[in-house]
């Protein structure tokens, strides 16, 4: 059986302050069952950016319907970007459990924020 891949196609994305940023992520398989979460940064200090199951993320929306059967696109859109949003974003697949277990991370997408054109 082919190993699950978490694909973040863009190494970097540059966005003007105030605009929206789209961070792309797809998975190569629906198996194993489990959620996708987005983080900024890596390691124990990473910041949770988006989790479908719980939490309130007012500036983050899913590009595709994350509840749809057979959905393999877990891209997100972050609105009203500010310089504080700069960093490397990771799309991470978890295996469903109690608790969920981290399975595989994408390679990361570095978001850089340009000054708003005057």
């Amino acid at each position: 059986e082919e190993e699950l891949q978490v694909i973040q196609p863009e190494k970097s994305v540059s966005v003007a302050a105030g605009d929206s940023a789209t961070l792309n992520c797809t998975v190569s398989s629906l198996i194993p069952v489990g959620p996708i979460q987005w983080f900024r940064g890596a390691g124990p200090g990473r910041e949770l950016i988006y989790n479908l199951k719980e939490g309130h993320f007012p500036r983050v929306t899913a590009v595709s319907d994350p509840t749809k059967r057979n959905n393999m696109d877990f891209s997100i859109r972050i609105s009203n970007i500010t310089p504080a949003d700069a960093g490397t974003y990771y799309c991470v697949k978890f295996r469903k459990g109690s608790p969920d277990v981290e399975l595989k991370s994408g390679a990361g997408t570095e978001l850089s924020v340009r000054a708003k054109p005057s």
Partner: antibody, heavy 124, light 106 residues
Framework: AVTLDESGGGLQTPGGALSLVCKGS????????MNWVRQAPGKGLEWVAG????????YYGAAVQGRATISRDNGQSTVRLQLNNLRAEDTATYYC?????????????????WGHGTEVIVSS | ALTQPASVSANPGETVEITCSGG?????YGWFQQKSPGSAPLTVI????KRPSDIPSRFSGSKSDSTGTLTITRVQAEDEAVYYC??????????FGAGTTLTVLG
């Protein structure tokens, strides 16, 4: 108990428009995807349209694509189906359905509750 | 559309299986009972094998490969109905089978 109450059916004229409303109660409406399913006289079940729990994503069956709009108001616990340019083939009983905590619009395997249905007759 | 047998029959107390195939890869199946035309369908199984709280345990569902199966053990006269399976195709569109008429003999 979960209840889904449809309204808005009745006699419609060809080329006209109809608006069906389904009111849900007995469950957390905003947590569940919803679908509309219809059944023409003497025929089987046909999926019409569906909508995700937050209303951001909508899905339509081939027979109504371009003529239908599904929307929801989670504050009022209602889902609405608007169908334009009505044809005789739209004559059917229309059922509102609720997904049971899985899937989204179109994911019929997740339907766990049905309304009583509202009859629509398209005739001149 | 999904593929299911047009009809099945069983004697009271027997076990009957109704199959359904043709859903999208990795998709699940639901099963809906309609006792008479024009009456509202009732979900007996959803998400492959989950049973709504008001449905007797005689009804069960399973999925193997891409085929879903509804199993009714100890069939009773009141189970006589048309059973529809439902799923989504690979494009995400909802699809039903044409329905299977269950006749309880005797």
């Amino acid at each position: 108990a979960v209840t889904l109450d449809e309204s808005g059916g009745g006699l419609q004229t060809p080329g006209g428009a109809l608006s069906l409303v389904c009111k849900g109660s007995g469950f957390t409406f905003s947590s569940h995807a919803m679908n509309w399913v219809r059944q023409a006289p003497g025929k089987g079940l046909e999926w019409v349209a569906g909508i995700s729990s937050d209303g951001r994503f909508t899905y339509y069956g081939a027979a109504v694509q371009g003529r239908a709009t599904i929307s929801r108001d989670n504050g009022q616990s209602t889902v609405r189906l608007q169908l334009n340019n009505l044809r005789a083939e739209d004559t059917a009983t229309y059922y509102c359905t609720k997904n049971g905590g899985c899937g989204s619009g179109g994911d019929l395997d997740c339907i766990d509750a049905w309304g009583h249905g509202t009859e629509v007759i398209v005739s001149s | 559309a999904l593929t299911q047998p047009a009809s099945v029959s069983a004697n009271p107390g027997e076990t009957v299986e109704i199959t359904c195939s043709g859903g999208g890869s990795n998709n699940a199946y639901g099963w809906f009972q309609q006792k008479s035309p024009g009456s509202a369908p009732l979900t007996v199984i959803y998400d492959n094998g989950k049973r709504p709280s008001d449905i007797p345990s005689r009804f069960s569902g399973s999925k193997s490969d891409s085929t879903g199966t509804l199993t009714i053990t100890r069939v009773q006269a009141e189970d006589e109905a048309v059973y529809y399976c439902g799923s989504a195709d690979n494009s995400g569109a909802g699809v039903f089978g044409a329905g299977t008429t269950l006749t309880v003999l005797g």
